[in-house]
């Protein structure tokens, strides 16, 4: 029950739509038993998929409140999924929903290997040995959830760059264009482990995003959602590096786990960018190899998807 009890509407946000979503969450929490973990996960993701597909009065909230709601949903979802997945039996689970929400989850006894979770628009690779806190006897869980609908609530969310990156960008680019807000290129994804201490991973996690086309000469950034003190948040790049990007895919490497996305910032790239090499048909052969390898994994990988839906 503790998993659900803290996931309630954010204070100060008045939305009928959001209230109904959290009513459903609380109902699921009340009825929850460990044997229902699989069904409960599906019901929560179904409810979230439907919420973000038809956000109703959420889209009439001021932008900042929308960002607070998104932050609250991402944070709570990660906690709830982590808690519930500890009651799943070993194996790989894939769920997908009509509006695009997707969950890939692997539960194992701790093993010394890397794990790859593949989805329609994202691939995640990391070492298994980071999934569990040392001394924790339970199973290890690695999860990845893609939430394309979250982009509606994160429109115009600010990007806060580290001072060093900011300086480097201003040296190599004409500077931020006037309208300022970066464009969300990819789905928003959230990655989690049974170990909730993921602020400083011993070896980095790699994400490969499939996304909308990049506008030529625009800056592509791998970002994560940093939950602010005020319960809201912003996009940030600390601990995340953009390994390479092509027209419709980008590889990111991060030293922590959170919610991630690929943004296109409004910079006009003047020349070759030392922060990020944009891969073209010519050079960058090492990165080309990574892309080719990822492409093969993408098509060979899989695991079936399960559609689960109801009314209401």
């Amino acid at each position: 029950d503790m998993t659900f009890s803290t996931w309630t509407p954010p204070p100060g946000v008045h939305s009928q739509t959001l209230s109904r979503f959290f009513d459903k969450v609380q109902d699921l929490g009340r009825d929850y038993k460990p044997g229902l973990a699989n069904n409960t996960i599906q019901s929560i993701l179904q409810a979230l998929d439907e919420l973000l597909e038809a956000p109703g009065d959420l889209e009439t909230l001021p932008r900042l409140q929308q960002h607070c709601v998104a932050s609250h949903l991402l944070d709570g979802l990660e906690d709830v999924l982590r808690g519930l997945s500890k009651n799943l039996s070993n194996g790989l689970l894939n769920f997908s929903y009509p509006a695009g929400t997707e969950l890939s989850l692997e539960v194992q006894k701790q093993v010394d290997r890397s794990v790859t979770l593949r989805q329609n628009q994202a691939v995640m690779q990391l070492d298994w040995n980071q999934a569990q806190k040392s001394g924790d006897p339970g199973p290890s869980v690695v999860g990845l959830v893609s939430i394309p609908g979250m982009g509606k609530l994160l429109a115009e969310a600010p990007l806060v760059l580290e001072p060093e990156k900011q300086m480097l960008l201003h040296e190599t680019h004409q500077g931020l264009l006037q309208d300022g807000s970066p464009i969300l290129l990819s789905d928003v994804i959230s990655a989690f482990l049974s170990n909730n201490d993921t602020q400083n991973l011993s070896s980095p996690v790699t994400f490969t995003f499939s996304h909308r086309s990049v506008i030529p000469r625009q800056k592509v950034l791998c970002v994560f959602w940093e939950h602010g003190q005020n319960g809201c948040g912003h996009w940030a790049t600390t601990g995340c590096s953009t390994i390479g990007t092509r027209d419709t895919s980008t590889i990111c490497r991060c030293t922590h786990l959170s919610s991630f996305a690929v943004l296109m910032a409004h910079y006009d790239v003047q020349e070759e960018d030392p922060v990020l090499t944009v891969i073209t048909g010519g050079g960058g052969s090492g990165l080309n190899d990574i892309f080719e390898a990822q492409k093969i994994e993408w098509h060979e990988g899989g695991g079936g998807s399960h559609h689960h839906h109801h009314h209401g």
């Epitope: 009928q16 739509t17 109904r20 979503f21 009513d23 459903k24 998929d49 439907e50 919420l51 597909e53 038809a54 956000p55 109703g56 009065d57 959420l58 889209e59 009439t60 009509p98 509006a99 695009g100 839906h309 109801h310 009314h311 209401g312």
Partner: antibody, heavy 118, light 112 residues
């Protein structure tokens, strides 16, 4: 002010087709699920079909499944119901209605009469 | 073929209180919120009560709703001639291939 304005009703022969339209104003159309509900003369209300904001979720009542098609054009703030293979029992006033997530039909169109008769 | 059952008609004098019952099952009323709709003669239905007991803005507090288990009730106090209409309960049904279900409808007649 939320408004749903309907058109497209009329008299049609059994087996024929008709397309109903509903144009919305006064709210963010793309944020809401939309529905069609009908009412046969002198009878009660019957839910017909539902479509979510981006058309990811579409549902039909068993009585119209395979014959009716719901669709929407968010750029035009419009909802449609394509009715094929019409039968006498489809004769009714058809209403479009807005629905909030997990909630009721909070706004209704004025209704349009569809008469199926030879 | 409605799955929510309402009394066909209710009669009362102006100023009186009337209640309309709506009976369902665990897959509809027992599983979701109930709404009530008012349909004045020759007009489209209008939302009267939602989420079992909430009133949209503009609906007077003479109208109230409640739910217990698999049945719901609409109450109208201080009945007025303008309340003469058909009233329908409604909810989502989670049983296979079902969608939104309405009650059979109740005709409220204001006497005198």
């Amino acid at each position: 002010e939320v408004q749903l304005v309907q058109s497209g009703g009329g008299l049609v022969k059994p087996g024929g087709s008709l397309r109903l339209s509903c144009v919305a104003s006064g709210f963010i159309f793309r944020s809401y699920s939309m529905n069609w509900v009908r009412q046969a003369p002198g009878k009660g209300l019957e839910w017909v079909s539902s479509i979510s904001s981006s058309s990811s979720y579409i549902y039909y009542a068993d009585s119209v499944k395979g014959r009716f098609t719901i669709s929407r054009d968010n750029a035009k703030n419009s909802l449609y119901l394509q009715m094929d293979s019409l039968r006498a029992e489809d004769t009714a006033v058809y209403y479009c209605a807005r629905r909030e997530y997990g909630g009721p039909f909070d706004y209704w169109g004025q209704g349009t009469l569809v008469t199926v008769s030879s | 073929q409605s799955v929510l059952t309402q009394p066909p008609s209710v009669f009362a004098a102006p100023g009186e209180k009337v209640t309309i019952s709506c009976s369902g099952s665990s897959s509809n009323i027992g599983n979701d919120y109930v709404s009530w709709y008012q349909q004045l003669p020759g007009t489209a239905p209008k939302l009267l009560i939602y989420d079992n007991n909430k009133r949209p803005s503009g609906i007077p507090d003479r109208f109230s709703g409640s739910k217990s288990g698999t049945s719901a009730t609409l109450g109208i106090t201080g009945l007025q001639t303008g309340d003469e209409a058909d009233y329908y309960c409604g909810t989502w049904d989670s049983s296979l291939s079902a969608g939104y279900v309405f009650g059979t409808g109740t005709k409220v007649t204001v006497l005198g």
